[in-house]
Structure formats: structure tokens, C-alpha cells
Amino acid sequence: KAMHVAQPAVVLANSRGTASFVCEYASPGKATEVRVTVLRQADSQVTEVCAATYMMGNELTFLDDSICTGTSSGNQVNLTIQGLRAMDTGLYICKVELMYPPPYYMGIGNGTQIYVIDPEPCPDSDF
């Protein structure tokens, strides 16, 4: 048994290859430092997509070159993944770690299946 992390089962990326979903965690007490990691599971391989550590009350900050952005509100994190293509379709798992105060506490969501459909190229037009 570990911290419960909830996330939607399915999300469809938009035509620009952007997908957003909410990752919500349930923990008693008040954590002040939280790390959120997005993992992608495909073909039994798990890879880290992005990660951010934030102090409660502050903004969620990913690395400058990250494909993820996000905002936090209480025990809820709104995650956005950009630049997705059809080949990026897969299960995106939200992992939440309470880093401070101790003890360390971790929870992993069941994952959000993100479907990405590459847009059809626009046909040439005379207009």
C-alpha cells in the first residue's frame, strides 16, 4: 500500500501534438517539497519523460529543454506534454514523491494512455 495517485485512463493529444492531464495524489499531512515524474511505458520498457520538483505554493518548474510544462494546486498537478507524434502513443505514468518533510513517500498512478494521431498533410490547393 502506498500513496494513492489518480490520473485519467485515456487522453487524446490535439492536432498540434499536445496532451494534458491531471495527476492527483492523496497524502495526509502537508508535504512542502514534492517531485513529480512522468514515465512512459511502451513494449514493457519504462523511460522517464520529464520530472519536476516543486515547493508547495510555488510553480512547477521543469528543465528548459523539457517537453513538459505544468501547474500545481494543492495535491493536484496539471501536466502538459508537447511535441508528441504518433510514435509517442503509449502509457504515461505519473509518479509522485514527497521529498520533504521526512519520511520519503512515493506513489505511482495507473497511467494515462495518450493517443497521438499525426495530422494529415494539407493537400496542395489552387486557392
Epitope: 500500500k1 502537508k30 517539497e33 520533504y100 521526512p102 519520511p103
Partner: antibody, heavy 114, light 108 residues
Framework: EVQLVESGGGLVQPGRSLRLSCRGS????????ISWVRQAPGKGLEWLGF??????????DYVASVKGRFTISRDDSKFIAWLQMDSLKTDDTAVYYC?????WGQGTLVTVSS | QPVLTQPPSVSVAPGKTARISCGGN??????VHWYQKKPGQAPVLVIY???DRPSGIPERFSGSNSGNTATLRISRVDAGDEADYYC???????????FGGGTKLTVL
């Protein structure tokens, strides 16, 4: 296997100093605050202080009874933390543990006696 | 700073359920953690965040927290459970941990 191992305990005279070391392995040492907790003979657990992680600038905090006498520091590149104890008193005699609260070392005995 | 009050001792017959309380003003608003301490051994985290068990801790250990009392329950107690048990919370005002005084569990 996660490990925290303390060393440096022993017999020391009142007023003298002692430095305890705590070496961590097989966990995210640099992400977590490292605390020192002691247990004097026949007494309960007493938190002494901690050094926070680099995300918090490795800042420290101490219980009032040891503030100014004890200093905690860390070197994440070596996976090690220290407890520097100065001006030791006889009632500092205890087993000293380093801990992340999830994980605890086996403890090292410090005896302050003349 | 919160004061956590534990009974100095609790006795229980083998196979029965031991209940160890930890009292504190509105403790339900805090995350409570429990540690087992055997003589000559390091403390072990047995329950954290009120009711969760770290890996390796038997299901016989459970916790709850409501109102002004958190409780550690140990079902089907055996002689190996004899130890001192400490509750702990994090004081958000001082940003420091606080331990209860400890409870000695004796298996009759």
C-alpha cells in the same frame, strides 16, 4: 540493500569534541534530509537536528538543547553526513543514529565521562 | 510545539491485538509515523502517513488517526513484537520532528 552506517563513537571526556560520520548507500542520499537522533540510557528517542537536501540549500536546524554545540553537515559527492559535537557533557552519553526516518543506521555509542 | 502523549507500557497476551495510542491536540490534521525500537537495534519505521506500511512490514501492523488520537494496532501479537514503539509527527511551525515518549509493549 539500503544502508546508513555511523562511525566515530567512543569514550570522550567532558568538554571535549567528537565527530560522528554517517555514510549512505543504495538510495537517493542527495535528495533527502539527513537527521541525527539519539537515545540516552533508559530514555526515549530525541531528535538532535538535520541537514536538509541541496534543494533547500543544505540548511540546518537543531533542537534547542544542542544548538551552538552540535553542527551537522554533508557531502553528497561522498554520500556522507557528519555530526560535530563540541563541549560535550555527561548527559550527551547516548547511542547516536543517523536517519532519513525511512532508513536508520545501526547507531554508534558515545560515552562522555571523565 | 505539539506534545505527543503515549502510555508508558502496554501488555498483551500472545495472539491477541495490541493497541498503542498517541494523543495530541487535533493530531488527525498531522501525518503520524510509528517506529519500533528493540534493545540494541536501530529503530524501524513500521507505519507512516497514518496507516501505510513500508515494504517488509507485516500486515499485522496497522495504523489509524482521527480526532486527538492516533493508534498503532498489532494483531496476532507474538514475542518478537516486544519492543518500544514511538509515534512521531512533523511540527510545521518549527519545521522539526517531534517524538512521543514511547510505549513499551510486553507480550505476556
Amino acid at each position: 540493500e539500503v544502508q546508513l552506517v555511523e562511525s566515530g563513537g567512543g569514550l570522550v571526556q567532558p568538554g571535549r569534541s567528537l565527530r560522528l560520520s554517517c555514510r549512505g548507500s543504495n538510495f537517493n542520499f542527495d535528495d533527502l534530509a539527513i537527521s541525527w537522533v539519539r537515545q540516552a540510557p533508559g530514555k526515549g528517542l530525541e531528535w538532535l537536528g538535520f541537514v536538509r537536501s541541496k534543494a533547500y540549500g543544505e540548511t540546518t536546524d537543531y533542537v534547542a538543547s544542542v544548538k551552538g554545540r552540535f553542527t551537522i553537515s554533508r557531502d553528497d559527492s561522498k554520500f556522507i553526513a557528519w555530526l560535530q559535537m563540541d563541549s560535550l557533557k555527561t548527559d550527551d552519553t547516548a547511542v547516536y543514529y543517523c536517519t532519513t526516518f525511512n532508513y536508520w543506521g545501526q547507531g554508534t555509542l558515545v560515552t562522555v565521562s571523565s | 510545539q505539539p506534545v505527543l502523549t503515549q502510555p508508558p507500557s502496554v501488555s498483551v497476551a500472545p495472539g491477541k491485538t495490541a493497541r498503542i495510542s498517541c494523543g495530541g491536540n487535533n493530531i488527525a490534521s498531522e501525518a503520524v509515523h510509528w517506529y519500533q525500537k528493540k534493545p540494541g537495534q536501530a529503530p524501524v519505521l513500521v507505519i507512516y502517513y497514518d496507516s501505510d506500511r513500508p515494504s517488509g512490514i507485516p500486515e499485522r501492523f496497522s495504523g489509524s488517526n482521527s480526532g486527538n488520537t492516533a493508534t498503532l494496532r498489532i494483531s496476532r501479537v507474538d514475542a518478537g513484537d516486544e519492543a518500544d514503539y514511538y509515534c512521531q509527527v512533523w511540527d510545521r511551525t518549527t519545521d522539526q520532528p517531534v517524538f512521543g515518549g514511547g510505549t513499551k509493549l510486553t507480550v505476556l
